[in-house]
Interface confidence: low
């Protein structure tokens, strides 16, 4: 299993990972929306985006990982596994992983998955924008 780094990645490395994550995230979201027609725009989950202890924009891998582990059984496992693999690189060793539970109700579960995918895509765009506009 990949060992989480004990240091922060350079912005250039973070950008590379985000560029890997972006098409996977976008594809998952588009596919889910097309298959689950009629689901409302969702604010069901509040996906943490940035690490609070870094001056540079840095995705909070430790906080986001459990959401993807939670939605994995009802999503495209192959793509989710690749997202988890990339998020693991962004995980800081000191940061513990929280437990995230899927809602029991089927409709709520769908909303939860949609929210995670929407918010993660938005998070990636936000961080990428910050990295592109900031000093390198």
């Amino acid at each position: 299993s990949h060992m989480a780094p004990t240091h922060r990645l350079q912005p250039s490395d973070v950008r590379k990972i985000i560029l890997e994550l972006r098409p996977m995230s976008k594809g998952l979201l588009q596919d889910y929306v097309s298959k689950e027609i009629g689901l409302p725009e969702s604010n069901h989950s509040s996906l943490p985006c940035l690490s609070s202890d870094s001056q540079l924009p840095h995705i909070n891998g430790s906080a986001i990982l459990p959401y993807f582990r939670a939605i994995r059984p009802l999503s495209d496992k192959n793509t989710i596994d690749k997202i988890i693999e990339q998020l693991d690189k962004l995980k800081f060793q000191r940061e513990p992983e929280a437990e995230v539970s899927m809602p029991a109700d089927n409709f709520e579960r769908k909303n939860f998955i949609l929210a995670v995918l929407q918010q993660f895509s938005a998070c990636l765009e936000h961080v990428l924008q910050s990295l592109n506009s900031g000093p390198q």
């Epitope: 098409p23 594809g27 596919d31 889910y32 097309s34 298959k35 089927n106 579960r109």
Partner: antibody, heavy 118, light 111 residues
Framework: DVQLVESGGDLVKPGGSLRLTCSVT????????WNWVRQAPGKGLQWVAY???????DYADSVKGRFTISRDNAKNTLYLQLNNLKAEDTATYYC????????????WGQGTLVTVSS | EIQMTQSPSSLSASPGDRVTISCRAS??????????MHWYQQKPGQSPKLLIY???NLESGVPSRFSGSGSGTDFTLTISSLEPEDAATYYC?????????FGGGTKLEIK
């Protein structure tokens, strides 16, 4: 209605190469999953490979490193490149769509026969 | 990889008979109330055709005499009243995890 039409099957010698084509109408290959499944003469079905809407690919262990699945979005066409062919690759190769959000193969092509023999 | 075991490998039955085919997975294919198990029919010289998806859902256009049941590792395809055109080989398949795997098939012959 969704239609899948395979072509490219042929008689090839061991160690040889072949490219199979699956032309899709009625659905976009940039949505869902698109698979190759094979069936040796008189035998059962074996999943070979898939390419997902986001371009993610996966392969059966028996073909990893020898077969490559790809697509041409503009032509709405899938391909399976078969290299270093072995006698045990002799089979009818079917193209199939995974529907129901990646749950089951709901549309299949008619198949194309690949024969590997010296 | 998940191994799929179908039984019987072949059977012979008469029109009007009730027929059951079993499929056992080497591990559970259930998650969040879904069973990722499907059934296909393949007639001689034809492509496979989806009959049942997610254990018990009848695919559009499939006659209602076909039904599926089961969860976890044990699943059954039932034909309530056999018709001559049901002569075919039937396969179960799991999509719970990669690689997606099929059962060995059950060849159904009509007497």
């Amino acid at each position: 209605d969704v239609q899948l039409v395979e072509s490219g099957g042929d008689l090839v010698k061991p160690g040889g190469s072949l490219r199979l084509t699956c032309s899709v109408t009625g659905d976009s290959i940039t949505s869902g999953y698109w698979n190759w499944v094979r069936q040796a003469p008189g035998k059962g079905l074996q999943w070979v490979a898939y390419i997902s809407y986001s371009g993610i690919t996966d392969y059966a262990d028996s073909v990893k490193g020898r077969f490559t699945i790809s697509r041409d979005n503009a032509k709405n066409t899938l391909y399976l490149q078969l290299n270093n062919l072995k006698a045990e690759d002799t089979a009818t190769y079917y193209c199939a769509r995974y529907g129901n959000y990646g749950y089951a193969m709901d549309y299949w092509g008619q198949g194309t026969l690949v024969t590997v023999s010296s | 990889e998940i191994q799929m075991t179908q039984s019987p490998s072949s059977l012979s039955a008469s029109p009007g008979d009730r027929v059951t085919i079993s499929c056992r997975a080497s591990e559970s294919v259930d998650t969040y109330g879904n069973s990722f198990m499907h059934w296909y029919q393949q007639k001689p010289g034809q492509s496979p055709k989806l009959l049942i998806y997610r254990a018990s859902n009848l695919e559009s256009g499939v006659p209602s005499r076909f039904s599926g049941s089961g969860s976890g590792t044990d699943f059954t395809l039932t034909i309530s009243s056999l018709e001559p055109e049901d002569a075919a080989t039937y396969y179960c398949q799991q999509s719970y995890e990669d690689p997606w795997t099929f059962g060995g098939g059950t060849k159904l012959e009509i007497k």
